[in-house]
């Protein structure tokens, strides 16, 4: 992005860039490869305590590893700023022997005009500033140092970037005179990465760009322009990679249409058009490109970024995403579910699964949920028989096998993972859902008739009679 | 110290009006939400009016919408609930409250009793 | 409007036990959820704020969990200064109701 030499202040200077990648110099630990699960694939949970069991004994060895918690460190160049003007931050904890960086962009939805910032900043004000944060934070999901917790990337350099710009991670406006907030997401997560350069983020194999939701779609627009600034500050040998979590939304018409009073009823399209102005948002430059000036608020939907993106990214989606559902005017109260309702929600899984259809490495279960990568219980969660974490692990293997994303998929290891079934929660492997009346655990079959669904109708296309299906989702199979 | 003092309540007969103060010191009031908040004898609490730092978006609860209504005169760092049509199921403890994160200080309360 | 539904009602403890107070909202409100305790004839106190963030000078014994539309706070061996009412808060568009709160008695 031009301008970007304003950020660095004198001083400031990242390390330059090493003088070779080829091997670790005498003495730096090497770094540990993926580890290969096809072999245990049938006695997984043996494997699992004898890694358990042997991190554990080597836990003695590493008194860092003791500690679970990421630190915080407000940015050294104060000029970029969270919306009230205090430094943004981000939450490290390394690792010494890896050459792996987990870099996490936490969501948060956004506002848009001064009025829903106001009321953000009343509420949720630890999204807007940083002058509460805690010195700490627990890593949990992916951002896990446990591996039982943690199977995919437990040794990884963690990096949780909490969003406190409220712009998708896209806005680059300070605060001044005219403007009550800053917006500097897309700016913040430049800083923060020529600040983790100086903290070893220079010998870095590969750079992970993870985020959830709000975080998820940050990903999408800014994995590129990581790329592009490692490159630029003499890194190119560190691959950068993007993991968008529950951040691919759809354009879609609403359900019920609202006009655009608040964050909550405003309809997506409307809500970005919105916020890329009052944020002074950018997105990628290959979309950019694509479309007229004005018209950049498309880059923000993953189906139309996705194409134009040259960092491989993963995609994990619930195909009934409940913030997508939400922006959608649809609001599951636990009353009986219309018909109406009920097809307009099948439709949305529907179009959703279309979108995934050409992107090699994505993960959709047929959910209704919200968010994944972080949740402790991020690993049971299955598509086809396979969890995130495997997905993951088969993807960085068909990314070591071809520093593209190889098209032939590797036997036994599969990355393209998009439930085909219909309906929400036909998935067994789905997170519990309650009664929002008596808060009881609903098994799959009790949800989908509280959901409205004729089971009739929801057997014949499976060529099962009603009784059969019933008995299987209640088995969970 | 954040200190927020209501005052203004005591016994209105049905129909009629009042107005609640609230007194905020120890903080930059306007860079604060500020919320009105009522507890009737014996029961739960119940959110009623909101006003916004900065632009002073206001937002009501239903039953108390047409009725009430919130200001702030921030040069006096006050806060104030102008009640009409008051009706005995309005009998409440009213408090007045800062947010940032949740309602984080809350004053003593001001009691308001609507009864002929 | 979001509806919370906050159980138990009413709880019997003794000092020293752990204790789970829970709240539903009757949609998805994305951690955006406040706890406060209430003792006798005294004004509410905030005690976590989005859901897990303990607010200023409060016990570690007490601890908030949850996301979408289950919340719950946990306290942790109970002090004799713990007993009151308790309520829960969502802030997820208004209005920003509250649940019905949770009397906690020494048994």
């Known amino acids: 992005s031009e301008g970007r030499k304003t950020w660095r202040r004198r001083g400031q200077q990242p390390p330059p860039p090493p003088r070779t990648e080829a091997a670790p110099a005498a003495g730096q630990p090497v770094e540990s490869f993926p580890l290969d699960f096809t072999a245990v694939e049938g006695n997984m949970d043996s494997f699992m305590a004898q890694v358990k069991s042997l991190a554990q004994s080597l836990y003695p060895c590493s008194a860092q590893q003791l500690n679970e918690d990421l630190r915080l460190h407000l940015l050294l160049n104060t000029s970029v700023t969270c919306n009230d003007g205090s430094p943004a931050g981000y939450y490290l904890k390394e690792s010494r022997g890896s050459r792996r960086w987990l870099l996490f962009l936490e969501g948060g939805w956004y506002c848009f005009n001064r009025e829903n910032c106001d009321s953000r900043y009343d509420t949720m004000r630890r999204l807007m500033s940083s002058r509460d944060w805690p010195r700490t934070r627990t890593g949990t999901g992916i951002l896990s140092s446990q591996p039982e917790e943690n199977p995919y990337w437990w040794n990884a350099n963690m990096v949780f970037i909490p969003y406190c710009s409220s712009d998708v991670w896209s806005g680059a406006s300070s605060k001044s005179e005219k403007n009550e907030y800053a917006f500097m997401g897309a700016l913040i997560i430049q800083e923060v990465v020529r600040e983790l350069l100086g903290r070893g983020l220079s010998g870095a194999k590969v750079l992970l760009l993870a985020g959830s939701s709000a975080g998820g779609t940050g990903v999408l627009l800014n994995v590129d322009r990581v790329a592009e600034q490692l490159e630029k500050l003499g890194y190119p040998a560190i691959q950068v990679r993007g993991l968008a979590d529950s951040g691919w939304f759809l354009d879609n018409k609403q359900y019920r249409h609202t006009d655009c009073v608040d964050t909550i009823t405003c309809a997506p399209t409307e809500a970005i058009r919105r916020g890329i102005r009052y944020w002074n948002g950018v997105v990628p430059e290959r979309c950019r490109r694509q479309f007229q000036e004005g018209e950049e608020w498309n880059c923000f939907f993953g189906y139309k970024v996705y194409p134009t993106l040259r960092c491989p990214v993963f995609v994990v989606q619930w195909l009934f995403d409940e913030a997508q559902l939400t922006v959608d005017n649809v609001h599951l109260t636990g009353q009986p579910v219309q018909e109406g309702l009920r097809l307009y929600i099948q439709n949305l899984g529907r179009e959703l699964r279309h979108t995934l259809k050409d992107v090699p490495a994505s993960f959709a279960p047929a959910c209704l949920s919200h968010e994944i990568i972080i949740r402790s219980h991020w690993t049971d969660v299955q598509v086809k028989g396979t969890s995130l974490p495997r997905a993951l692990h088969c993807w960085d293997r068909s990314l070591h096998d071809s520093h593209k994303a190889s098209k032939t998929p590797l036997k036994g290891c599969p990355v393209h993972l998009v439930d085909s079934c219909p309906w929400p929660h036909c998935n067994p492997s789905c997170p519990t859902v309650r009664d929002q009346f008596t808060g009881q655990e609903m098994n799959v079959a009790q949800f989908l008739m509280h959901m409205g669904f004729d089971m009739q109708t929801v057997a014949q296309p499976q060529g099962l009679e009603p009784s059969e299906l019933l008995g299987m989702l209640s088995n969970g199979s | 110290d954040v200190q927020l003092v209501e005052s203004g309540g005591g016994l209105v007969q049905p129909g009629g009006s009042r107005k609640l103060s609230c007194a905020a010191s120890?903080?930059?009031?306007?860079?604060?939400?500020m919320h009105w908040v009522r507890q009737a004898p014996e029961k739960g609490l119940e959110w009623v009016a909101y006003?916004?730092?900065?632009?002073?978006?206001?937002y009501y609860a239903d039953t108390v919408r047409g009725r009430f209504t919130i200001s702030r005169d921030t040069p006096k760092n006050t806060l104030f609930l102008q009640m009409t049509s008051l009706r005995s199921e309005d009998t409440a403890m009213y408090y007045c409250?800062?947010?940032?994160?949740?309602?984080?200080?809350w004053g003593q309360g001001t009691s308001v009793t609507v009864s002929s | 409007d979001i509806q919370m539904t906050q159980s138990p009602a009413s709880l019997y403890v003794s000092v020293g036990e752990t204790v789970t107070i829970t709240c539903r909202a009757s949609?998805?409100?994305?951690?955006?959820l406040a706890w406060y305790q209430q003792k006798q004839g005294k004004s509410p106190q905030l005690l976590v704020y989005?859901?897990?963030n303990l607010a200023d000078g409060v016990p570690s014994r007490f601890s908030g969990s949850g996301s979408g539309t289950q919340y719950s706070l946990k306290i942790n061996s109970l002090k004799s200064e713990d007993f009151g009412s308790y309520y829960c808060?969502?802030?997820?568009?208004?209005?920003?109701?509250f649940g019905s709160g949770t009397k906690l008695e020494i048994k």
């Open positions: 006003i916004t730092s900065g632009s002073g978006a206001i």
């Open positions: 409250a800062r947010s940032a994160d949740g309602l984080d200080y």
């Open positions: 949609e998805n409100i994305y951690s955006n």
């Open positions: 989005g859901a897990t």
């Open positions: 120890g903080f930059t009031f306007s860079s604060f939400g």
């Open positions: 808060q969502h802030f997820w568009g208004t209005p920003f109701t």
